[in-house]
C-alpha cells in the first residue's frame, strides 16, 4: 500500500560535512516496526546510504559503522548524515516502510538536495 513521505527540498551541509533533516511520513497508526532507508540518487543510479529499523518500544538504531544517525518521534524521523564531501552533493531520498503489523505500507519522499562545500584549506602561515 502507498503512503506519503515528506522531506525538505534543500539542505546545506555544515563545514564539517554533516547534514540533518526530518523525514515525516503519513501517520503510522498502529505500526510497531518501521524501517527507514536513506537512498542517494545520482543520475539514474540509486544507492543505499544507510538503513535502520525501529519499533515503537525502542529508539531508532543505525548500525555502529553507519554514516547515519537518527532519532524517531511518532511519525517523524530526524536523520543526520555524516562524513559528507563535495562529491557527496546529490539528491537524498527518504524511504519509509511500515513493516509490522500488517498491512505493509511504503512511502518515498521526493528527495532532499544536499549541497556539500568542502572547506578551503587554511593558508600556510609563515
Amino acid at each position: 500500500k502507498g503512503m506519503h513521505a515528506a522531506q525538505p527540498a534543500v539542505v546545506l551541509a555544515s563545514s564539517r560535512g554533516v547534514a540533518s533533516f526530518v523525514c515525516e511520513y503519513g501517520s503510522s497508526g498502529n505500526a510497531a516496526e518501521v524501517r527507514v532507508t536513506m537512498l542517494r540518487q545520482a543520475g539514474s543510479q540509486m544507492t543505499e546510504v544507510c538503513a535502520a529499523t525501529y519499533t515503537v518500544e525502542d529508539e531508532l538504531a543505525f548500525l555502529d559503522d553507519s554514516t547515519c544517525t537518527g532519532t524517531s518521534s511518532g511519525n517523524k524521523v530526524n536523520l543526520t548524515i555524516q562524513g559528507l564531501r563535495a562529491m557527496g552533493t546529490g539528491l537524498y531520498i527518504c524511504k519509509v516502510e511500515l513493516m509490522y503489523p500488517p498491512p505493509y505500507y511504503v512511502g518515498m519522499g521526493n528527495g532532499t538536495q544536499i549541497y556539500v562545500i568542502d572547506p578551503e584549506p587554511c593558508p600556510d602561515s609563515d
Epitope: 497508526g29 498502529n30 510497531a32 509490522y100 500488517p102 505493509y104
Partner: antibody
Framework: EIQLVQSGGDLVKPGGSVRLSCKAS????????MNWVKQAPGKGLQWMGW????????TYADDFKGRFTFSLDNAKNTAYLQINSLRAEDTAVYFC?????????WGQGTTLTVSS | DIVMTQTPLSLSVSPGEPASISCRSS???????????LEWYQQKPGQSPKLLIY???NRFSGVPDRFSGSGSGTDFTLRISRVEADDAGVYYC?????????FGGGTKLEIK
Amino acid sequence: EIQLVQSGGDLVKPGGSVRLSCKASGYTFTNYGMNWVKQAPGKGLQWMGWINTYTGEPTYADDFKGRFTFSLDNAKNTAYLQINSLRAEDTAVYFCARRSIYYPYWGQGTTLTVSS
Amino acid sequence: DIVMTQTPLSLSVSPGEPASISCRSSQSIVYSNGNTYLEWYQQKPGQSPKLLIYKVSNRFSGVPDRFSGSGSGTDFTLRISRVEADDAGVYYCFQGSHVPWTFGGGTKLEIK
C-alpha cells in the same frame, strides 16, 4: 503507569448480547493495536483478533467472525468487544491486550458466563 | 491457519533443576521482513499472562536471565536454567507472524 481495566462481564442468558469494555490509560491509545483473547474454563488462550485503534479496522480469527464485533471510543480511550446470540460455549474469561511487536500489557480479564 | 504444538503438556521439576518446553509451528513463522514474531508467556491461576520472551530469544525487561528462548523456522524452545518455586504456572508460545495469530496449547509446569 500503563493500565488496561476491563469491565462488563456478567451472567447472561443464551441468545442475549453483551458488551465488554477495556479502558486504557497511561499511553497514547491510538498508537497501539488492541487485541482480544479468550480463555474458556480450564482451557488455553485463544487469539480472537485485533482492532487498529488508529483506523478502526478490525481483524477477526475465523472462529470469531459473525457474532463478535470489535469497536472503539477513542474519546474514552476504550475498546469494546460485543458478542451477540450468546451460547454456552462463549462462557470464558476475555482479556484485552495491547500489542506492538509483543503483548507487554494485559487487562485483568473479565468473566462472561452464559447460562439459563 | 498455523497450528502451534507445545510439548510436553505438563512437566514436574525440582527446584534448581532445568526445564525445557518445545513449541513447533505447522509451517514457517518467518515474517516477510525476516523477523520471527515468536513469543513466550507465563500464566498463573487467576492472573493475566505475562510476557517472558519476544522475537524468539529476546528477554522482556524484568524477566530473570534464567529464562531463555531459542529456535528458528518451525522449532522453538523455552528453557529455564534453574527452576524456582515461583515459576509454577502454564507457559504458552505465540506466533504473531501470520494472521490469524495463534497460541500454543500450553504447558503446565509443576514444582516438585
